[in-house]
């Protein structure tokens, strides 16, 4: 004879476990039904009645089979620096990612908590390390014999053109000017771009030039306290 199928709630065999999509309720001491994603436990089970589930309210969600009394609050609305790549629904939290030209300065479990614009290296400085989805551009002063005349998050320092006769010597922010009609160059002319996983920073974050200071000694900082807890007010 086929084994009899137990309907929830039921008492498990001694030492046994509840089935998939069921949980053991300590109070009732029974195996009871979990609620599906998008729902939560409105009334917990008893020895004689199963779990009563209800839909998540607006701006709340459950992603897994569960028996939580309240759904989880969706995260804060995405800021203007971000793009909502996954909307808040009853079954999933919203996910915010950085828009092109920005990087994630503060990550969270899914998506990004704070986006910041990729740094643009000003004339006289070139990109030492390109930005990524989670790290900013690193700029370095152009070494003697190289220059950068752009404000860019992708251009590196490139060599001065080599002149037969120099009209104006090059510096960190300007190429050499030749009197000869056929200068030679160790690299192809034009700005040199580093490969970049994220596009260049939008124009609105152009740095305000200021007097250059010599780079100081960098200090490695231990990770400090977290920023204010994320708002859970949702929409």
């Amino acid at each position: 004879l086929p084994a009899q199928v137990a309907f929830t709630p039921y008492a498990p065999e001694p030492g046994g476990t509840c089935r998939l999509r069921e949980y053991y309720d300590q109070t009732a001491q029974m195996c009871c039904s979990k609620c599906p994603p998008g729902q939560h436990a409105k009334v917990f089970c008893t020895k004689t009645s199963d779990t009563v589930c209800d839909s998540c309210e607006d701006s709340t969600y459950t992603q897994l089979w569960n028996w939580v009394p309240e759904c989880l609050s969706c995260g804060s609305r995405c800021s203007s620096d971000q793009v909502e790549t996954q909307a808040c629904t009853r079954e999933q939290n919203r996910i915010c990612t950085c828009r092109p030209g920005w990087y994630c300065a503060l990550t969270k479990q899914e998506g990004c908590r704070l986006c910041a614009p990729l740094r643009k290296c000003r004339p006289g400085f070139g990109v030492a390390r390109p930005g990524t989805e989670t790290s900013d551009v690193v700029c370095k002063p152009c070494a003697p014999g190289t220059f950068s005349n752009t404000t860019s998050s992708t251009d590196i320092c490139r060599p001065h053109q080599i002149c037969n006769v120099v009209a104006v010597p090059g510096n960190a922010s300007m190429d050499a000017v030749c009197t000869s009609t056929s200068p030679t160059r160790s690299m192809a002319p034009g700005p040199v771009h580093l490969p970049q996983p994220v596009s260049t920073r939008s124009q609105h974050t152009q740095p305000t030039p200021a007097p250059s200071t010599a780079p100081g000694t960098s200090f490695l900082l231990p990770v400090g306290p977290s920023p204010p807890a994320e708002g859970s007010t949702g929409d």
Partner: nanobody, 124 residues
Framework: DVQLVESGGGLVHPGGSLRLSCAAS????????ATWARQPPGKGLEWIST????????TYADSVKGRFIISRDIAKNTVYLQMNNLKPEDTGMYVC?????????????????WGQGTQVTVSS
């Protein structure tokens, strides 16, 4: 103990001004990029401004450009945000952060030290 402490927030009328301070202790601010961000009520954190330590360059979000000024006093180990012509949409929790420029192999580039924030409310 490494920490940042913000102060200077409060209630101000539209058109008014506030100067926020972010004081560092336990480390030297001079070798770090400084960033201010804010969290409006019910919204996510949004970037406002960054001051790069190596060149003293300053960048600003469109929404605050021409009204806010970021600055630093190395002797006082403090970064400031001067906020002028404040608007109701500037309301929020303002936090500052210090990060070593570009990170390193030992500590990847990410905001390393955060303050707890200071509340700014702009209302008539």
């Amino acid at each position: 103990d490494v920490q940042l402490v913000e102060s200077g927030g409060g209630l101000v009328h539209p058109g008014g001004s506030l100067r926020l301070s972010c004081a560092a202790s336990g480390f030297t601010f001079s070798a770090d990029d400084a960033t201010w961000a804010r969290q409006p009520p019910g919204k996510g954190l949004e970037w406002i401004s960054t001051l790069y330590f190596d060149t003293e360059e300053k960048t600003y979000a469109d929404s605050v450009k021409g009204r806010f000024i970021i600055s630093r006093d190395i002797a006082k180990n403090t970064v400031y945000l001067q906020m002028n012509n404040l608007k109701p949409e500037d309301t929020g929790m303002y936090v500052c952060t210090a990060t070593w420029a570009g990170g390193s192999l030992l500590r990847p580039a990410s905001f390393g030290v955060w303050g707890q924030g200071t509340q700014v409310t702009v209302s008539s």
